[in-house]
């Protein structure tokens, strides 16, 4: 999983990287497979329901390095881990809701500081 | 400088199976994938599959699964082609070729004589 | 699979004269991630083929510069701008934005 104080920008991979997709795939994909130059990612997120979601796919190289930076969203409860080791490598992702805050479900008092 | 070595010619007889060889140097084996095209004689270039010697990760064209596997050997930085049941529709020249994105160097290829 | 459809078969030309290959796909050729995946090769008798142009536009290393590529979505060119007579051969565009990788028929540009 990338750090959330990776500030690099992601160097160019001399060579395609395959990664398994779901819920997240390309027209054409062949055996739920995709192709980038950049990383495969695992996504888990609550859906309008409450339910959890799992989305897997490719991410491009470009802008890549921000999407997998996982950086949290108010009122929005989702994670994501990206990889580019080998092949299919998102197959081994496994992330995991952050925990409920009690705010999210909750309308407390509105503190000003 | 990138090359592959390819043995140039092949006869086999029908029913037969045969694995053919390329030879990777003068760059880094695992960093690229390993692509194999046929071609016969008016009938052009047709990609046969691809492997990543760095995971042994293998993707291939449908029309080939069953007829074609593709294995690497990172110790001595070469790719095989087994080709088995062959018949007279096998005969061609078979490339190897480097691909990352799209393929740069290209072997010389091997002719492959399906004969009895 | 995407059909890739080369015009000319055949081109006969004169040395000196400018060159000029077509090539449509079946469907488009911009991959997800925005490249698109489309290559050029000369392929000389008893040879194998020699990347020219890789990416649409960009030529590959020691390619000269009377070769140029463009194009985009499902048609593409290649051009050369003064034929020499070590450009004879078979002219052969690619794809690998979609598995399978299809190949072009070939051009086979000869003398006039």
């Known amino acids: 999983k990338k750090e959330d104080g990776e500030s690099t920008a992601p160097t160019p991979r001399p060579k395609v990287l395959r990664c398994k997709c779901h819920h997240h795939c390309p027209e054409d994909s062949v055996n739920n497979i995709c192709s980038t130059d950049g990383y495969c990612f695992t996504m888990i997120e609550e859906d309008d329901s409450g339910l959890p979601v799992v989305t897997s796919g490719c991410l491009g190289l470009e802008g890549s390095d921000f999407q997998c930076r996982d950086t949290p969203i108010p009122h929005q409860r989702r994670s994501i881990e990206c990889c580019t080791e080998r092949n299919e490598c998102n197959k081994d992702l496994h992330p995991t809701l952050p925990p409920l805050k009690n705010r999210d479900f909750v309308d407390g008092p509105i503190h000003h500081r | 400088q990138v090359q592959l070595q390819q043995p140039g010619a092949e006869v086999v007889r029908p029913g037969a199976s045969l694995k053919l060889s390329c030879k990777a140097s003068?760059?880094?084996?695992?960093?690229?994938?390993m692509q194999w095209i046929k071609q016969r004689p008016g009938q052009g270039l047709e990609w046969i599959g691809e492997?990543?010697?760095?995971?042994?990760?293998?993707m291939y064209n449908q029309k080939f699964k069953g007829k074609a596997t593709l294995t690497v050997d990172t110790s001595s930085s070469t790719a095989y082609m087994q080709l088995s049941s062959l018949t007279s529709e096998d005969s061609a020249v078979y490339f190897c070729?480097?691909?990352?994105?799209?393929?740069?160097?290209w072997g010389q290829g091997t002719t492959l004589t399906v004969s009895s | 699979d995407v059909v890739m459809t080369q015009t000319p078969l055949s081109l006969p030309v004169s040395l000196g004269d400018q060159a000029s290959i077509s090539c449509r796909s079946s469907?488009?050729?911009?991959?997800?991630?925005?490249?698109?995946?489309l290559h050029w090769y000369l392929q000389k008798p008893g040879q194998s083929p020699n990347l020219l142009i890789y990416?649409?536009?960009n030529r590959f290393s020691g390619v000269p510069d009377r070769f140029s590529g463009s194009g985009s979505g499902t048609d593409f060119t290649l051009k050369i701008s003064r034929v020499e007579a070590e450009d004879l051969g078979v002219y052969f565009c690619?794809?690998?934005?979609?598995?399978?990788?299809?190949f072009g028929s070939g051009t086979k540009l000869e003398i006039k």
């Open positions: 469907q488009s050729l911009v991959h997800s991630t925005g490249n698109t995946y």
């Open positions: 070729a480097r691909f990352g994105f799209y393929v740069d160097y």
């Open positions: 492997i990543d010697p760095s995971d042994n990760y293998t």
């Open positions: 990416k649409v536009s």
């Open positions: 690619s794809q690998s934005t979609h598995v399978p990788f299809t």
């Open positions: 003068g760059y880094t084996f695992t960093s690229y994938w």
